[in-house]
Interface confidence: low
């Protein structure tokens, strides 16, 4: 079940002329007829079998249609039909003259129609309007169109029933598709089984409406997760409903006897450790000093001689004391300390007694130190050496090695960079503040002259037979070293041959 | 007639954002879904985001989901398209249209759309 609705929002019919290109008098009086039929190929004449509207009188002539579906739902127009949707139509507008008020059909003359449309497809179920627009030779026609689902009817064809509903054969309301959905707090095929307080437990606890735990025999608490103990249990819990498990120290039936005598009466005396042994039954391990059932009794601690090598013991509140004899330290007197008999000097030190033996102290030699004289001095650890140098320790003394341009004890004399004569060739040195800077004679170049800029004399390979080519740099020009069976300056001579037949 | 006219475009750097507006008129504007629609250069249309009539729903498309907003408001007969976050990809002709139908990912068929307006994100 559902309704097929129709909006028409604007006609047009500028020349005021009926279908057959009369024109009306004195306008064209428009209503409609519409007609709703099951798909056809081609629409043709026949029983609108879904179903048939007409309007009023809307406008004269070309005229918009205004939205009046809050008062008196003429528009859009309501086509209801009471069978399943099929997903395609026809559909049949018939725009008409009125000369008068009677709009039956049998009241008007045939030839009042104005226009007619025709228009078939598929159209799904929706809320969402689809917009045509039909235009003739003298007219054009807007409007648009939907199916939607009568009250209680859902799915894709409408086709569904579903009537929401609070009682107790259900809660819930309807889905756009028609399933069930259920009220909060009620879960189920047809949504009557109430969802229980949240926690509530899913064995021991139930519910007859929503966020209620009514708990089932032998358990209580507010989620019905706590069980009941058996009656009478007095110290003991249960983890199954009847059940008395008893507590840390109690016993019996329903654990009524006290088995942790050490807590509840604390019978020890003077810090001693208590122990359970059964009921009403205890044991107490004394702490040194102490003895009896309950260690109530003091024992005088220098009873064990506790004290070693000859030491004395004097008995304190908290304990005990060992004086001990020279030469031995500690708690008992368990340490003997060093004299100058064990040679504890390092290093040549030399050992001086002091406290008539009890203890002694080391004279260190020159360049070692520490308390047995173990730890050689360093003389660079305060960094002595300027300007980079760097610290050597040697024997007794210490050195600094200076960067290049430093000299003096601790590097701190800038050498003239140019004291060395460092330029080549006769280039003349200038003093840098970070280093020097050679001006080079014609034909050199590089940073110190070092370069000959001068024209290769061997680049022309004046020599001959494969002899090797050796610039003079200082006359500019070649010397040839000739190979074994040849001679000349250019090495052009085989030996044997006279001069004046060149080879 | 319907009339769907769309303004807000321009050129954004990546990253900036848009506003789009669309002003309907012509037919009830409030009892229609609405429609972002966009065409880079070259490329056919790619639906970007819609809205039910009241505004209740909306729908993006995987691209936009949590850049774009799109809202309306029925009683200025306009519609909205938020865009922060833009990229260059975004770069295209956007439309304001009504759908005509829905496909599996949004509409896909309008019955009416607007002359568009142009939106460049530059890198």
């Known amino acids: 079940s559902g309704v097929f609705q129709l909006q028409l929002q604007e006609f047009i019919n500028e020349r005021g002329v009926l279908a057959s290109g009369r024109p009306c008098e004195p306008g064209c009086r428009t209503f409609f007829r519409v007609c709703l039929k099951h798909f056809q190929a081609v629409v043709s004449p026949g029983p609108c079998t879904f179903g048939t509207v007409s309007t009023p009188v809307l406008g004269t002539n070309s005229f918009a249609v205004r939205d009046d579906s809050s008062g008196g739902g003429r528009n859009p127009l309501q086509l209801p039909f009471n069978f399943t949707w099929p997903g395609t139509f026809s559909l049949i507008i018939e725009a008409w003259h009125a000369p008068g008020d009677d709009l039956r059909p049998e009241a008007l003359p045939p030839d009042a129609l104005i226009s007619k449309i025709a228009i078939q497809g598929s159209l799904a179920v929706g809320q969402n309007w689809l917009l045509d627009e039909q235009t003739s030779t003298l007219t054009r026609l807007r409007y648009s169109y939907r199916v939607i689902c009568s009250d209680n009817y859902y799915g894709d064809n409408c086709s569904r029933l579903c009537k929401k509903r609070n009682d107790h054969f259900g809660h819930y309301v309807c889905q756009p598709d028609g399933n069930l959905s259920c009220l909060p707090g009620w879960t189920g095929e047809y949504c009557q089984q109430p969802i229980c307080l949240s926690g509530c437990h899913e064995q021991n606890g139930y519910c007859s409406k929503p966020a209620e735990c009514l708990c089932r025999p032998g358990w209580q608490g507010r989620l019905c997760n706590e069980c009941i103990p058996h009656n009478g249990c007095r110290h003991g819990t249960c983890s199954t409903p009847w059940q008395c498990t008893c507590d840390e120290g109690w016993g019996g039936l329903f654990c009524d006897q006290d088995l942790n005598y050490c807590t509840h009466h604390s019978p020890c005396k003077n810090g001693a450790t208590c122990s359970n042994s059964g009921q009403r039954s205890y044991t107490c391990t004394c702490r040194p000093g102490y003895t009896g059932v309950d260690c109530e009794l003091e024992l005088s601690e220098c009873d064990s001689n506790p004290c070693r090598n000859g030491g004395s013991c004097k008995d304190q509140e908290d304990g005990y004391h060992c004086l001990c004899p020279p030469g031995y330290y500690g708690l008992h007197c368990e340490h003997s300390t060093l004299s100058c008999a064990d040679s504890p000097c390092f290093n040549g030190g030399s050992c001086r007694e002091r406290n008539q033996g009890a203890n002694y102290a080391c004279e260190c030699p020159p360049n070692f130190t520490g308390s047995n004289c173990e730890k050689k001095v360093d003389r660079c650890t305060s960094n002595p050496c300027a300007n980079g140098g760097q610290c050597l320790n040697r024997g007794p003394s210490r050195m600094c090695r200076c960067r290049p341009g430093f000299t003096g004890t601790y590097c701190e004399l800038h050498v003239s960079d140019c004291a060395r004569n460092p330029c080549a060739h006769g280039g003349t040195c200038h003093d840098l503040e970070n280093g020097l800077m050679c001006t080079c004679p014609a034909g050199f170049s590089g940073r110190r002259c070092e370069v000959r800029t001068s024209i290769d004399a061997c680049a022309s390979s004046p020599c001959f037979n494969r002899a090797t080519c050796y610039t003079d740099l200082s006359t500019d020009t070649f010397v040839c070293n000739c190979p074994y069976g040849f001679v000349g300056s250019r090495c052009e001579f085989p030996v044997g041959l006279p001069p004046s037949f060149p080879w | 007639e319907v009339q769907l006219v769309e303004s807000g475009g321009g050129l954004v750097q990546s990253g900036g954002s848009l506003r789009l507006s669309c002003a309907a008129s012509?037919?009830?504007?409030?009892?229609?879904?609405m429609s972002w629609v966009r065409q880079a250069p070259g490329k056919g249309p790619e639906w970007v985001s819609a809205?039910?009539?009241?505004?209740?729903?909306?729908y993006y498309a995987d691209s936009v989901k949590g850049r774009f907003t799109i809202s309306r408001d029925n009683a200025k007969n306009t519609l909205y398209l938020q865009m922060n976050s833009l990229k260059p990809e975004d770069t295209a002709v956007y439309y304001c249209?009504?759908?005509?139908?829905?496909?599996?990912?949004?509409?896909?068929?309008?019955?009416?759309w607007g002359q568009g307006t142009q939106v460049t994100v530059s890198s």
């Open positions: 809205i039910n009539s009241g505004g209740g729903s909306t």
């Open positions: 249209a009504i759908p005509r139908g829905w496909g599996p990912t949004g509409p896909h068929e309008y019955a009416y």
């Open positions: 012509g037919f009830t504007f409030g009892s229609y879904d």
